[in-house]
């Protein structure tokens, strides 16, 4: 019968008694940087080409015996998970292995760098189809390793890495912390984060998604037809490398940004029990478990968006945090969040010719996060329109005045320390969808975009008094591009997008008493691409 | 994911205006930085990745590596160039004493230097 992990990543329409998704990733080459591998294992024979690359440190300990099957264990299993004949994700993918980990599973940053350089040189000498690089390893944060990953990603290579098995913030490890790399955490058959002894899967904003990573059946180097069950974020990353190979084989022209957005879009949402994560990491950690798309033909017509959290700003009075989108993505909105509620909002600003999302801490605040909504919007022309504080009682307003431009997001930023001490504005009048409204003492920023067939609408959900959180979701066929709160009182901790839902968090003041003036509204901006949607319906 | 400011140790060593009367003095006011792994047991002191500025050519990387070796030798230190990087990042991998870091950070074209560290199968 089909192993649990393959069943979990397979959409229901492909589930039979056997895992048989269409196309096995045959147009894609997957590079594996790991231990040595048993290349003639029945699961992977003829599928893996062992390169002559080897850069490993000597094994620790004077009495260490190099037992071949132990030396090959990790890499053989992962090669089997990616492309194994019986238990692999992408059975048609061909692989190339580089040895960067020794018989104890240990390597160096420098050895990994030289391995990545070897891949780049191979790519230049003999350009092939799409390349996926699997890095089932982790070390401490390394600027140079992250930089090398960035360069390789910008050369069109998809890098997939393990989040790490340290039950810690993945941002403290490399290559997991490299923004260009697809970083994968591990979940088990119960969709719980994987516990590994006293530790477990890493988490946090540097994780892109999770994948099966406990009791994963794969090729064992004990014998050529043996199987073994292994666990870890390496196994999870191998699943995503396999899924990426399948997606790229179906759509070889996909960019890294498009692939990442699709991986997120087709993931199972909100199935992970977040209670396992430290409380301060829950909001930052994506609740996504990787899955294959329901069809090999892409969903190019869809408007894909993802949420990118910044690093924490730190607590100083003028501290700011910046969230950035990938080079191929458009920043369609910007919001901010602070656990203490002390913040001075956020703004979209140009940095190096690209829009970024900057959040501002307030005096006495413990720090803020900036939250960018990053979307794939081909042929988009986006700009930010700003209105300075109105000072008048009606609040500050700004709208998209250019012909054909639609509102995709609203941000507000204020210099006063606490908007809550000032009379909040009235809510935005109805029937003006292309307008952002905010506190009279705040400057308001509207993200206005022109793109073929782009249409957007505003959805609101308000409750009379803050009760922890208010949400509003975009309906089927629409994608959340903007998420903000009305009004910007001190009760509001911030707003952020979770998949297609806008979440506004506020302090629960039900115990301290509240007035109707303190109503909180979650404002979602939902968009879709009209002409692409129509084109897809005609195809169906 | 992580931006420039990760949770890792950074030593910023100011560049002096002249070093051994170099012909190629570094650009005025720039500061090369030194990085090492925040997790002490994972550090591999004695091996360093010297990363050069983005547009540095292979020949300049090789020249910078040779210059480091020559200057180290004048101070009585042995160094070994283990690898010259090109294709992804310009730079080189060097086995040397940590005493030479200050000297290395003052070399022309140097962007930053990172001490080697361990990575592990996950």
């Amino acid at each position: 019968s089909i192993p649990w992990n393959l069943e979990r990543i397979t959409p229901p329409r492909y589930r039979a008694d056997e895992y048989q998704p269409p196309d096995g990733g045959s147009l894609v080459e997957v590079y594996l940087l790991d231990t040595s591998i048993q290349s003639d294992h029945r699961e992977i024979e003829g599928r893996v080409m062992v390169t002559d690359f080897e850069n490993v440190p000597e094994e620790d300990g004077t009495r260490f015996h190099r037992q071949a099957s132990k030396c090959d264990s990790h890499g053989t299993h992962l090669a089997g998970v990616v492309s194994g004949r019986d238990a692999g994700v992408a059975k048609g993918a061909s692989m190339r292995s580089l040895r960067v980990l020794n018989c104890q599973g240990k390597g160096t940053v420098s050895g990994t760098l030289i391995g990545l350089e070897f891949i780049r040189k191979s790519q230049l000498v003999q350009p092939v189809g799409p390349l996926v690089v699997l890095l089932p390893l982790a070390g401490g944060y390394s600027r140079v390793l992250n930089a090398a990953c960035q360069r390789l990603a910008r050369a069109g290579v998809v890098l997939v890495t393990a989040a790490g098995n340290f039950r810690d913030d993945a941002c403290l490890y490399s290559p997991a912390s490299a923004p260009e790399v697809i970083t994968v955490g591990a979940t088990n058959a119960q969709d719980q984060p994987v516990t590994l002894g006293t530790l477990g899967t890493n988490f946090g904003r540097c994780v892109d998604l999770f994948a099966p990573g406990e009791d994963i059946i794969g090729a064992s180097s004990d014998c050529s037809t043996c199987f073994v069950s292994q666990s870890g974020t390496s196994q999870a990353a191998a699943h995503v490398a396999g899924i990426a190979a399948m997606m790229l084989s179906a759509e070889p022209e996909l960019t890294l940004a498009e692939l990442r957005q699709r991986l997120i879009h087709f993931s199972a949402k909100d199935v992970i029990n977040e209670a396992w994560f430290p409380e301060d990491q829950r909001v930052l950690t994506p609740n996504l478990v990787a899955a294959l798309p329901p069809s090999t033909h892409g969903a190019g017509w869809q408007l894909f968006c993802r949420t990118v959290w910044s690093a924490h700003s730190g607590p100083t009075r003028m501290a700011t945090a910046i969230a950035r989108c990938a080079p191929d993505e458009e920043l369609l909105s910007c919001s901010s969040f602070s656990r203490s509620g002390k913040r001075r909002g956020e703004r979209m600003e140009a940095q190096g010719g690209k829009l970024v999302c900057r959040a501002h801490n307030a005096f006495g605040g413990e720090g803020v996060y900036a939250i960018a909504r990053c979307c794939l919007l081909p042929q988009a022309n986006c700009s930010v329109h700003t209105a300075p504080p109105a000072e008048a009682s009606m609040g500050t307003r700004v709208h998209c005045h250019q012909q054909g431009h639609v509102l995709t997001g609203c941000s507000s930023h204020w210099e006063v320390e606490d908007l809550g001490t000032h009379k909040p504005p009235v809510l935005r009048p109805r029937g003006q969808p292309n307008q952002c409204v905010g506190h009279r003492e705040a400057s308001i920023h509207a993200s206005c975009c022109h793109a073929p067939g782009l249409e957007c609408k505003v959805k609101e959900h308000g409750i009379p008094a803050p009760q922890g959180q208010v949400t509003v979701a975009c309906e089927e066929g629409w994608t959340l591009t903007g998420c903000s709160a009305l009004p910007g009182t001190s009760h509001v901790l911030g707003a952020y997008a979770v998949d297609n839902t806008c979440v506004v968090r506020s302090r629960d003041v039900s115990t301290t008493g509240s007035t109707s003036e303190e109503a909180v509204t979650a404002v979602a901006i939902c968009c879709r691409s009209r002409h692409l949607a129509q084109a897809s319906q005609e195809l169906q | 994911q992580e931006d420039e400011d990760g949770d890792y140790e950074e030593l910023v060593l100011a560049l002096r205006s002249e070093e051994d009367g170099l012909a190629e003095a570094p650009e005025h006011g720039t500061t090369a930085t030194f990085h090492r792994c925040a997790k002490d047991p994972w550090r591999l002191p004695g091996t360093y990745v010297v990363v050069l500025k983005e547009e540095t050519h292979l020949s300049q990387s090789e020249r910078t590596a040779r210059r480091l070796q020559a200057q180290a030798a004048r101070r009585g230190y042995l160094t070994k160039i283990l690898h010259v990087f090109h294709g992804l990042l310009p730079g080189f991998l060097v086995k040397m004493s940590g005493d030479l870091l200050e000297l290395a950070l003052k070399l022309p074209h140097v962007d930053y230097i990172e001490e080697d560290s361990s990575v592990f199968a996950q």
């Epitope: 039979a16 008694d17 056997e18 048989q20 048993q38 290349s39 003639d40 029945r42 024979e45 003829g46 893996v48 080409m49 062992v50 071949a68 099957s69 059975k91 048609g92 004990d222 014998c223 050529s224 037809t225 043996c226 199987f227 | -």
Partner: antibody, heavy 115, light 116 residues
């Protein structure tokens, strides 16, 4: 192109041993193991076992276990199959085939066991 | 372990089509089966692998497009269209079973195809 070239025909007496060689070319030898299959006159195919060209691990069919030894020499990309204590019912054409996939086969070596 | 059953003989006229069957024993419906062609006096030649979803991987070297496979339940079929004289051969099917020390390869008895 991929080729498996086997040694020539052998005539052996019962109780003797035979060693058949199989020289591989046209691919990376250590990326595929070698399977050995035999075919008695007028009969179907019978699997004898497999050897890893990577680490020398073997997997033998129960019927020949204890009498068969499979080895490889990676320096010459050659696999060997030795069968001991030959009996008349070991008379067959012996084939080597590439890996578990068995996608390429040698031309066969006829071993005749006769007193 | 599975048992593979093949009819001893099959025949077809030149230019016609023929379907050869290899049947797995009960309980092995998910198994992949390999088809081999063996011309008189020659060694076996890999044709292709088949499971219930059809071909697995790619055809053997030099196998013409006239050869195709299908799988349904316990049956694995090899169909040859527009039969030529050079297709007159024995056709064997084989399957892998088990893992570790229990691993075996089993073959069917073979089907002798005659071109009329």
């Amino acid at each position: 192109q991929v080729q498996l070239v086997q040694s020539g025909a052998e005539v052996k007496k019962p109780g003797a041993s035979v060693k058949v060689s199989c020289k591989a070319s046209g691919y990376t030898f250590t990326s595929y193991g070698i399977s050995w299959v035999r075919q008695a006159p007028g009969q179907g195919l019978e699997w004898m076992g497999w050897i890893s060209t990577y680490n020398g691990n073997t997997n033998y069919a129960q019927k020949v276990q204890g009498r068969v030894t499979m080895t490889t020499d990676t320096s010459t990309s050659t696999a060997y199959m030795e069968l001991r204590s030959l009996r008349s019912d070991d008379t067959a054409v012996y084939y080597c085939a590439r890996g578990y996939t068995r996608d390429y086969w040698g031309q066969g070596t006829l071993v005749t066991v006769s007193s | 372990q599975p048992v593979l059953t093949q009819p001893l003989f099959a025949s077809a006229s030149l230019g016609a089509s023929v379907t050869l069957t290899c049947t797995l024993s009960s309980g092995y419906s998910s198994y992949e089966v390999d088809w081999y062609q063996q011309r008189p006096g020659k060694g076996p030649r890999f044709v292709m692998r088949v499971d219930t979803g059809g071909i697995v991987g790619s055809k053997g070297e030099g196998i013409p497009d006239r050869f195709s496979v299908l799988g349904s339940g316990l049956n694995r079929y090899l169909t040859i269209k527009n039969i030529q004289e050079e297709d007159e051969s024995d056709y064997h099917c084989g399957a892998d079973h088990g893992s570790g020390t229990n691993f075996v390869v089993v073959f069917g008895g073979g089907t002798k195809l005659t071109v009329l």
